[in-house]
Structures are given as structure tokens and as C-alpha cells.
């Protein structure tokens, strides 16, 4: 038994026929010793008398606020609430099974950017008697705060015979850092209670994986001349993260009709604008996605093809960013070849997701460990790697990232990758390798020498550890090369002379 | 399975045209764009233009712009493409090929080879 | 228009072997960029779109990768039916173009 809250208690019980139940007993919060009686619920049946009372408790009717009295008078409640594990496994009855992006997801969670604030949202059929509270940090460990809203409830379907209730809630990080590379997940705790029945969901991720941004906005159609051709332009949602020349988005521009099995055009770009063939009775579509690491693509915003009446100059904003007078170079050091490294580093972000696209879809935390694999660099927040420590010195950030290129590259190059089992012939892991080197070369040129950290030896003894520690490896190289490749694509677009 | 069968080859004389068709099979024939690319002997590809079954819409490339014509017959499920004022360059084998998506080519026809020679 | 280059024009391997084909931009695509297959006699044969999906039917030994102005197609091990022209196409913008192609014959 423990305390959820004040004179609220949770009987965990094992749920199997004629189980012996537990013993519990409730102590009446009181100074006096003598002439009290027991109640359950609105009862006045007396269960029992004295200050404290022993109940077994096997079942639902056993649970139920007990109160305590003397002479008529209440002298203090405890509610007693079940929580049942049936086979070793705690009770899911509340809510429901999403099943994306995979089974048993009770709790989903998004964030529009990097700004620490997320949105997690859940399912249930039922519509009374029920309760939620939330709780997160970042770590469980040592955690960081989080400081999270009421749950509310956001929408009501109709779901053939049955009503379906979403609730959700807002938690913002306490002290973001949205340009870092996250090493310890955010840990989501609800707490849901239904009449006597108790359970908890947990869900445990980074921001950088739960990103969907809002759909871009301000679509304008603009047909060119003497063909049948539009331009299309868009710009940025207001609520994605800035400078956007650091938080770069990728957008896919898609023309279809109203079928989702109606042909289509179809169009990647990194602009805010693209030429396209509309058609009648079609519209023109664009989502976005970040540019560096594979989340969540937005949903669509649209235009009809019809209305492309409404043209106007330019081609959106928000996507070069960084606007006015070009800074100058990095002071206390020499500057990198920016654009040589915005380009290898976007090369390394596609790379490493070609070398491991599922690993995305993998939960590799289940391994025990708090963060991907504790002995590999990270980007943090006092690194300098935000827009404003670049401008100040990007000396100790390009330091950063060179430490991590050297590291990964001695990791990719190590036993773990070259060990058995044997890495699939067609896996672009030789190619991430070769990138690394390359890009960790540019940024080191002759005689310029910054200490490099030490590997840790990972080498595991098991193939199938090897395997396990390979996905987490990639998955953490992920995130890496996101951030850099964001370094490297604001520097070149504000840094270089 | 969706299927292109084009005409037979053609020898031509230089400055005259040629119109090769295109029967579809296997698909509703407006649901599918159809491109026409070209591939000279021994050399690389060269897309000239697409179709729309749907409502004739067209886009040529700039190199075939005023000389080619590409048109449908939704009654037969064919298309077709005329190549004017031939000349001696034009000699290739001339693909059709559908997709749901504009801008790259899925189902191929097996070509026709068009000889252009005095 | 948007000129791609392919390289090597030849590339000979042995059956077994991987092979690397390359594919250049003259301006950045992002991921607009399409591989076909074409051997002699025949029509071609699309192998990956969008720079790196594969497609159902192909393969698993052909992957695709890149984005901006420098992509790379991968036969992972050769089998003695992947000896053919390989080509890339931009669809970035009109008009389409191809690159020259990449020959892949038997060492």
C-alpha cells in the first residue's frame, strides 16, 4: 500500500482467483484513543472499533473511502483505491491501446518545437467517475523539472455504438535548451483513477522525436505565363522554432484530386516555394518537416487549383533566415568552410538515417539504460552551438562537434560495427563513416590541433548486444549530426565572410 | 498489370513527320499522366513532354516545343505523338510510359524505333 | 535547365562486388531524383524514387541515398542480371533531364 495524496492510498493487488489478497490497516488521524467506530462508504454498517482497523483487501467491494468516527462526528477519511496486476502485468482498462506507433501506446505526445513545451494526449470509453493527474521531468535519476497543466477533456467522438472521450495535457521543460542535442529522455507519468480502480501510464521520449510541426501557412498561388504552371509559396508556421536559418524546415509540395488514389504531382524543397502543374479540381498541398531529423511530418494546408488568382511577389519568407548585414567571421579562431560543412553535414544527417531508418521506430531505452548509450558525446547547452554562442565564438562549438565526429568515426570504425554479426552488404554505414572523416577533417585542418575525448570500450561480448548497441549508437548519431548540420547551415547563412 | 504497347518502327525521310501511338491496358486511362521520352542509338535518355488523358493538358520540353504534339483517344485508350520536320538527329527509339505521379516514369512501353534518313 | 552528371561512365566490377554509381546535380533537388535501370534491347525500369524508396519488386540489394546536388545508388553484392546502364532523372523541375548514365559491366 502507499499514498497517492492526502488520505488517498493504492492497494496494489495480485488479480487471480482466490488470492489471498492484503492486509491493510488504516489508522485514524486523530488524537483520541477511544469510543471510535469504522464506516465504508455511505454505509453505517460498523466494520470495526478503536483507532486503527485491519481489512483484507481481495476486491472491489473491499476499497472505498473508510472514515472514521467518534460520537456522531467525522474524525478523518482514507480512501482506499485498487490497482490490480494480473500475470505480472499492471491493469490498462482505463485507457485505450492507440496501437501507434506501435501496440500498447496509451499516451501520444507532440511538440511543435524545440521550445520545451509538448502536448500529450490519451483515449478512454469512459465519460464518469474518472480522474487524471500528470506528472513528468527530463531523467528519472537526477530529473530536471517539468512543469505540466490539468488534463482536460479536448474531444468527443462517436466511435459506432461507443463514445470515445480524448483528454490531454500541456507540460513545458523548465529549463529548455532547444538548440542541444538531448541526452536523457522526458518522462511522462498519468495517474487515472476510475471509481476504486487505480493505474498509471508512463511514456518516456525526446523532443526531438515527438516534433510535428504546425502546417506552413500563407499559401499563395501565382500562375506563370504562357504555361500551365504555378508558383506556390508559403511560409513558415508562426510556431515553429527561430532563427530559422538554425531550425530549418524541409516541405513537400503535392498536388492531387480529391481521391487519395487521383494522380498527383509531387515536389521536395528546402525553399518556400516551388513550380507546380495544377489542375481543375485539384489543390495544392504542403507539409513540413525538419530538415535534420526525421520526426513528424505536419499536417497538409491547402489551396484549390481554382483559386489561383490570388499572386503576390516573392516567394514566403522564413526560409533563408537570418535577414540584414552579414556577421563577421568567428572572432579567437579561424572560420570553417561553412557551406562546404552545411553540405557534408547534411549529407551525414541523410546517411544516418539510411543507415538505421527503423531504429526511429524503436524503443531502445527498454534496455535499461536512462539515455541512448551513456558514454558518447553530447551537444550540450553550455557548448556555445546555439545561434548566440555561434555569434560570440563559434570556436567552442565547432570544438564540440569535432570531438563527436572523431568519436563516432572511431565507433563506426570499431568492433561493434565491424564485428559479427556482419552488417548487411548494402548498409550505408561505410559511407557514414567516410562522411565523418570527412567532415571532421574540414574542420581540423593541418596544424590545428584540439584534444579529442577518449573511446570508451563498448566493445560488447554477444553479436546480439553488438546489434542492440549498434542501433543505439546510429540513433544517437542521429541527433548529433541534426544539431550540427543546423550549426553548419545557420553559420553559413550568417557567418560566412 | 498495367501494360504499353507502341506501333512498329518507322523509317522517315528528313522534314516529314511521324505520329507513334501508345494503346494503354489495365488501368482506368485517365487516372495515369503519360510522358514520351526518347533514347538515341547508344546514347543517354531525353524526355520530351507529358499528357494529361484526363482533360489534354500538356508540357513539352523546350528542345520540342512547336514541333511535337501529343494527344490521347480516351475511347481507345491510346495516345499518340507527332514529331514534325524530322531530321536526321531525331532518329531514336521513342518510349511512352504512365505514372499517377508527373514527374517520374513507372510502367514503360517497349519503344519504337523511329529512323530518320534520305 | 538542370544538367545531371553522372560518374563513372564505366564502372566494372565482378559479380559479388558492390558498386557505387554517382549521381550530380548543377543546382540542388533536394531529394527529387529518380534511378532506372535499362539493359540492352529493353525498355528502362524504375529502381528507387525520391532519392532513397525503393520500390516493391526491386531488389533489396539497390539502395539509393543523398539529397541537395550529390546522390549515390548502391548494388550492395552484383548478380549477373545488374549488368547494365544505370540512369538518374531530376524531377525538381521541368523539363525533366537525365544523366548520361553509368555503364556497369563484368570485370
Known amino acids: 500500500i502507499w499514498e497517492l495524496k492526502k488520505d488517498v492510498y493504492v492497494v496494489e493487488l495480485d488479480w487471480y482467483p482466490d488470492a489471498p489478497g492484503e492486509m491493510v490497516v488504516l489508522t485514524c488521524d486523530t488524537p483520541e484513543e477511544d469510543g471510535i467506530t469504522w464506516t465504508l462508504d455511505q454505509s453505517s454498517e460498523v466494520l470495526g472499533s478503536g483507532k486503527t482497523l485491519t481489512i483484507q483487501v481481495k476486491e472491489f467491494g473491499d476499497a472505498g473511502q473508510y472514515t472514521c468516527h467518534k460520537g456522531g462526528e467525522v474524525l478523518s477519511h482514507s480512501l482506499l483505491l485498487l490497482h490490480k496486476k494480473e500475470d505480472g502485468i499492471w491493469s490498462t482498462d482505463i485507457l485505450k491501446d492507440q496501437k501507434e506507433p506501435k501496440n500498447k501506446t496509451f499516451l501520444r505526445c507532440e511538440a511543435k518545437n524545440y521550445s520545451g513545451r509538448f502536448t500529450c494526449w490519451w483515449l478512454t470509453t469512459i465519460s464518469t467517475d474518472l480522474t487524471f493527474s500528470v506528472k513528468s521531468s527530463r531523467g528519472s535519476s537526477d530529473p530536471q523539472g517539468v512543469t505540466c497543466g490539468a488534463a482536460t477533456l479536448s474531444a468527443e467522438r462517436v466511435r459506432g455504438d461507443n463514445k470515445e472521450y480524448e483528454y490531454s495535457v500541456e507540460c513545458q521543460e523548465d529549463s529548455a535548451c532547444p538548440a542541444a542535442e538531448e541526452s536523457l529522455p522526458i518522462e511522462v507519468m498519468v495517474d487515472a483513477v476510475h471509481k476504486l480502480k487505480y493505474e498509471n501510464y508512463t511514456s518516456s521520449f525526446f523532443i526531438r522525436d515527438i516534433i510535428k510541426p504546425d502546417p506552413p501557412k500563407n499559401l499563395q498561388l501565382k500562375p506563370l505565363k504562357n504555361s500551365r504552371q504555378v508558383e506556390v509559396s508559403w511560409e513558415y508556421p508562426d510556431t515553429w522554432s527561430t532563427p530559422h536559418s538554425y531550425f530549418s524546415l524541409t516541405f513537400c509540395v503535392q498536388v492531387q484530386g480529391k481521391s487519395k488514389r487521383a494522380k498527383k504531382d509531387r515536389v521536395f524543397t528546402d525553399k518556400t516555394s516551388a513550380t507546380v502543374i495544377c489542375r481543375k479540381n485539384a489543390s495544392i498541398s504542403v507539409r513540413a518537416q525538419d530538415r535534420y531529423y526525421s520526426s513528424s511530418w505536419s499536417e497538409w494546408a491547402s489551396v484549390p487549383c481554382s483559386g489561383s488568382g490570388s499572386s503576390r511577389g516573392g516567394s514566403g519568407s522564413g526560409g533563408s533566415g537570418g535577414g540584414g548585414s552579414k556577421l563577421r567571421a568567428v572572432p579567437g579562431g579561424s572560420s570553417p568552410a561553412w557551406t562546404q560543412c552545411q553540405q557534408l553535414s547534411q549529407k551525414l544527417c541523410t546517411l544516418a538515417w539510411s543507415a538505421h531508418p527503423l531504429v526511429g521506430h524503436m524503443d531502445l531505452r527498454e534496455e535499461g539504460d536512462e539515455e541512448t548509450t551513456n558514454d558518447v558525446p553530447h551537444i550540450q547547452c553550455g557548448d556555445g552551438c546555439d545561434p548566440q554562442g555561434l555569434r560570440d565564438n563559434s570556436q567552442f562549438c565547432l570544438q564540440r562537434i569535432h570531438q563527436g565526429l572523431i568519436f563516432y568515426e572511431k565507433l563506426l570504425g570499431s568492433d561493434i560495427f565491424t564485428g559479427e554479426p556482419s552488417l548487411l552488404p548494402d548498409s550505408p554505414v561505410g559511407q557514414l563513416h567516410a562522411s565523418l572523416l570527412g567532415l571532421s577533417q574540414l574542420l581540423q585542418p593541418e596544424g590545428h590541433h584540439w584534444e579529442t575525448q577518449q573511446i570508451p570500450s563498448l566493445s560488447p561480448s554477444q553479436p546480439w548486444q553488438r546489434l542492440l548497441l549498434r542501433f543505439k549508437i546510429l540513433r544517437s548519431l542521429q541527433a548529433f549530426v541534426a544539431v550540427a548540420a543546423r550549426v553548419f547551415a545557420h553559420g553559413a547563412a550568417t557567418l560566412s565572410p | 498489370q498495367v501494360q504499353l504497347v507502341q506501333s512498329g518502327a518507322e523509317v522517315k525521310k528528313p522534314g516529314a513527320s511521324v505520329k507513334v501511338s501508345c494503346k494503354a491496358s489495365?488501368?482506368?486511362?485517365?487516372?495515369?499522366?503519360l510522358h514520351w521520352v526518347r533514347q538515341a542509338p547508344g546514347q543517354g535518355l531525353e524526355w520530351m513532354g507529358w499528357i494529361d488523358p484526363e482533360n489534354g493538358d500538356t508540357e513539352y520540353a523546350p528542345k520540342f516545343q512547336g514541333r511535337v504534339t501529343m494527344t490521347t483517344d480516351t475511347s481507345t485508350s491510346t495516345a499518340y505523338m507527332e514529331l514534325r520536320s524530322l531530321r536526321s538527329d531525331d532518329t531514336a527509339v521513342y518510349y511512352c510510359n504512365a505514372n499517377k505521379e508527373l514527374r517520374y516514369f513507372d510502367v514503360w512501353g517497349q519503344g519504337t524505333m523511329v529512323t530518320v534518313s534520305s | 535547365e538542370i544538367v545531371m552528371t553522372q560518374s563513372p561512365a564505366t564502372l566494372s566490377v565482378s559479380p559479388g562486388e558492390r558498386a557505387t554509381l554517382s549521381c550530380r546535380a548543377s543546382?540542388?533537388?533536394?531529394?527529387?531524383l529518380h534511378w532506372y535501370q535499362q539493359k540492352p534491347g529493353q525498355a528502362p525500369r524504375l529502381l528507387i524514387y525520391?532519392?532513397?524508396q525503393s520500390i516493391s519488386g526491386i531488389p533489396a540489394r539497390f539502395s539509393g541515398s543523398g539529397s541537395g546536388t550529390e546522390f549515390t545508388l548502391t548494388i550492395s553484392s552484383l548478380q549477373s542480371e545488374d549488368f547494365a546502364v544505370y540512369y538518374c532523372q531530376q524531377s525538381n523541375s521541368f523539363p525533366l533531364t537525365f544523366g548520361g548514365g553509368t555503364k556497369v559491366e563484368i570485370k
Open positions: 543546382q540542388s533537388i533536394s531529394i527529387n
Open positions: 525520391f532519392a532513397s
Open positions: 489495365g488501368y482506368t486511362f485517365t487516372d495515369y499522366y
